[in-house]
Interface confidence: low
C-alpha cells in the first residue's frame, strides 16, 4: 500500500550498554476528528458514510505493522521477519535493545473498512542510540521496584539527571494507557498497591533548529514485598470456647497467617495445658492453604478419637510463631447441652 | 485449571541452536518466577535458570557459562529458554517450573525432550 | 555453589513399612529445602516445601524435618504407589536466588 500519506512521528530511543531494557511503539493512529488522514472529516456534515468510520486508537484491537527496509524493498511484516519484535494488541515491543532497531515502523488497521482507512496509518521513525559515557552516570533504572503499602516514586530514565524544575513535560503511559494527569519527570505513588506494577513508558519532545522528536524510555516497575515486620495472626479459631458432643471424635483446625519473609520458618503446633501439665500435641502435618507473593496462610489441625470428660477440663492451645514472634489462641471445650 | 506446557524440543546436531517456549495458562504470569530445569535420560533432576517475570531479569546456574538465554513475555505468558552451542551432554528433557511463595516449584510442565546429535 | 548431597541412592522396604531418605546442604540454607517425587516418564511432584510444611493434598504419612544443613524425608505406612525417585531441592540467596538439587533416591517397595 502507498505510505505517503501516513502520519508520521519520529522517536529516540537511548539504551544503556549496561542494562537489559526495552521498548515500545503504540499504534497511535491519529483521532478521526484531529486528523485529515482518516477519511471521517473528507466527508462533508449532509455525507453518510457507507461503512463506520475508522475510530482511532481508542478502540484499536487489531493492527497490522510493518518495517521499511532502508534500500526500498517492500515493506516486511514484523511478525514473519522479526523474532526479538513481539505484537501484543496494539504495541510492538521490542525485546533486546540495539541500534540494528533503528528503521522506519508502519501501523494500520487489519480491517480496512473503506478506500479511505487506506491512508488511516502511522510511520514511526525509530532512531536508536547507545548511551554515551558524558551521559548521566546516575540515571534511573529502566526495572524499578515500589515496596507496597509505602510512598515511592517511579523516575522517567532518560531525565532522572534533571531536576523537576528544568525538566520538559513528559507523557506517561502505564501498560499502553496514558496516565493524562502525570506531566513531570518523576511519578509520586503516595501508597503502592499490587496494581501499581506494570510497564510505564514516558515521552517527552526534543527539538533542534530543523525538526523535533520524541524521547521514549520504558521502565518495568515491579511491587514487592518487604519482609513483614507482624507475627503471624490466628485466623482460626476465633472463640476460646467450642461445645462437643461427649464421646465423639473432634478436629480443631487452627489457621494463621504469616506474611513474607524471605527466610522463611513458619512454626504452627498445637499443645495441651491441664492445670500445671503443658505438653506438645503429635498432630498431622501443617498444609499450606493460601499462596500469595505477600503471605502465606497455613493450616494445622488437632484430632481426638472422642472427646472425654478430662478433655472438658484441658485447654487446647495453638502456637503460631515467625522470626518477629509468637501468637496463641487457647479453645476450651464445653459440652454441648441439650 | 493452572498449567504450563513445554514446546519446541527436537533433534539438533552438535554445536547447533534451539528455542524452547513455556506456555502458562490459568494464572496470572506476572506474579511468579519460573525456572527452567533438566532431566538427562535415567539422571537426576538438574536446575538451569530462572526469571524474575516483571523485570525479565535471569540467574542461571554456574554450568550454563552463557550458552543458555532465558526470556519471557508477560502478554503472551510464555517463556523461552534459547540453548545455543549445544552438546550430547545437553540431551534431556527441559521442564519449565513455577516457582511457589517461597523457595519451591509448585507447579510442573510436562517436558519437552531435546536431542543433540549427529 | 550451593550443593546437595542426597543419601543414600536406593533404598528398598516393604509395604507398610517406613524408610527415610537424607539430604546434607553445603551452607546454611534455614528451612528453604523442598521435597519432590517423580515416577518414570512424569513430571516432578511437590511433596513438602519450607523443609517440613506438607504440600495440599499430599497424605501425611510423608514427613519433613531438619533445618540448616541436614534435612530427612520419612515415609512411613509405605504403599505400593510410594515406589518413585525423591529429590531434595533448596535455594539460597547471593544477589539473587539460587536453586540446586539433590542427586535422587529410588526407594523400591517391595
Known amino acids: 500500500f502507498n505510505i505517503s500519506g501516513c502520519s508520521t512521528k519520529k522517536l529516540l530511543w537511548t539504551y544503556s550498554t549496561r542494562s537489559e531494557e526495552e521498548f515500545v511503539l503504540f499504534c497511535d493512529l491519529p483521532e478521526p476528528q484531529k486528523s485529515h488522514f482518516c477519511h471521517r472529516n473528507r466527508l462533508s456534515p449532509k455525507q453518510v458514510p457507507e461503512h463506520l468510520p475508522f475510530m482511532g486508537s481508542n478502540d484499536l484491537s487489531d493492527v497490522q505493522w510493518y518495517q521499511q527496509p532502508s534500500n526500498g524493498d517492500p515493506l516486511e511484516d514484523i511478525r514473519k521477519s522479526y523474532p526479538h519484535i513481539i505484537q501484543d494488541k496494539c504495541t510492538l515491543h521490542f525485546l533486546t535493545p540495539g541500534v540494528n532497531n533503528s528503521g522506519s515502523y508502519i501501523c494500520r488497521p487489519k480491517m480496512i473498512k473503506s478506500p479511505y482507512d487506506v491512508a488511516c496509518c502511522v510511520k514511526m521513525i525509530l532512531e536508536v542510540k547507545p548511551q554515551t559515557n558524558a551521559s548521566c552516570e546516575y540515571s534511573a533504572s529502566h526495572k524499578q521496584d515500589l515496596l507496597l503499602g509505602s510512598t515511592g516514586s517511579i523516575s522517567c530514565p532518560s531525565l532522572s539527571c534533571q531536576s523537576d524544575a528544568q525538566s520538559p513535560a513528559v507523557t506517561w503511559y502505564k501498560n499502553g494507557k496514558l496516565l493524562s494527569v502525570e506531566r513531570s519527570n518523576r511519578i509520586v505513588v503516595d501508597e503502592v498497591y499490587d496494581y501499581h506494577q506494570g510497564t510505564y513508558v514516558c515521552d517527552y519532545t526534543q527539538s533542534d533548529t530543523v525538526s523535533s522528536w520524541t524521547v521514549r524510555a520504558v521502565v518495568q516497575v515491579r511491587t514487592i514485598v518487604g519482609d513483614t515486620k507482624l507475627k503471624p495472626d490466628i485466623l482460626d479459631p476465633v472463640e476460646d470456647t467450642l461445645e462437643v458432643e461427649l464421646g465423639k471424635p473432634l478436629t480443631i483446625s487452627c489457621k494463621a497467617r504469616f506474611g513474607f519473609e524471605r527466610v522463611f520458618n513458619p512454626v504452627i503446633k498445637w499443645y495441651i495445658k491441664d492445670s500445671d501439665l503443658e505438653w506438645e500435641v503429635s498432630v498431622p502435618e501443617a498444609k499450606s492453604i493460601k499462596s500469595t507473593l505477600k503471605d502465606e496462610i497455613i493450616e494445622r489441625n488437632i484430632i481426638l478419637e472422642k472427646v472425654t470428660q478430662r478433655d472438658l477440663r484441658r485447654k487446647f492451645v495453638c502456637f503460631v510463631q515467625n522470626s518477629i514472634g509468637n501468637t496463641t489462641q487457647s479453645v476450651q471445650l464445653k459440652e454441648k447441652r441439650g | 485449571q493452572e498449567q504450563l506446557k513445554e514446546s519446541g524440543g527436537g533433534l539438533v546436531q552438535p554445536g547447533g541452536s534451539l528455542k524452547l517456549s513455556c506456555k502458562a495458562s490459568g494464572f496470572d504470569f506476572s506474579n511468579y518466577g519460573v525456572s527452567w530445569v533438566r532431566q538427562a535420560p535415567g539422571k537426576g533432576l538438574e536446575w538451569v535458570g530462572y526469571?524474575?517475570?516483571?523485570?525479565?531479569?535471569?540467574y542461571y546456574a554456574s554450568w550454563v557459562n552463557g550458552r543458555f538465554t532465558i526470556s519471557s513475555h508477560n502478554a503472551q505468558n510464555t517463556l523461552y529458554l534459547q540453548l545455543n552451542s549445544l552438546t550430547a551432554a545437553d540431551t534431556a528433557t527441559y521442564f519449565c517450573?513455577?516457582?511457589?511463595?517461597?523457595?519451591?516449584?509448585?507447579?510442573w510442565g510436562p517436558g519437552t525432550l531435546v536431542t543433540v546429535s549427529s | 555453589a550451593l550443593v546437595m548431597t542426597q543419601t543414600p541412592s536406593s533404598v528398598s522396604a516393604a509395604v507398610g513399612g517406613t524408610v527415610t531418605i537424607n539430604c546434607q546442604a553445603s551452607?546454611?540454607?534455614?528451612?528453604?529445602l523442598a521435597w519432590y517425587q517423580q515416577k518414570p516418564g512424569q513430571r516432578p511432584k511437590l511433596l513438602i516445601y519450607g523443609a517440613s510444611n506438607l504440600e495440599s493434598g499430599v497424605p501425611s504419612r510423608f514427613k519433613g524435618s531438619g533445618s540448616g544443613t541436614e534435612f530427612t524425608l520419612t515415609i512411613s505406612d509405605l504403599e505400593c504407589d510410594d515406589a518413585a525417585t525423591y529429590y531434595c531441592q533448596s535455594a539460597y540467596y547471593s544477589s539473587s536466588a539460587v536453586y540446586a538439587f539433590g542427586g535422587g533416591t529410588e526407594v523400591v517397595v517391595k
Open positions: 517450573a513455577r516457582k511457589g511463595y517461597f523457595h519451591y516449584f509448585n507447579l
Open positions: 526469571i524474575d517475570p516483571v523485570f525479565r531479569s535471569a
Open positions: 551452607q546454611n540454607i534455614y528451612s528453604n
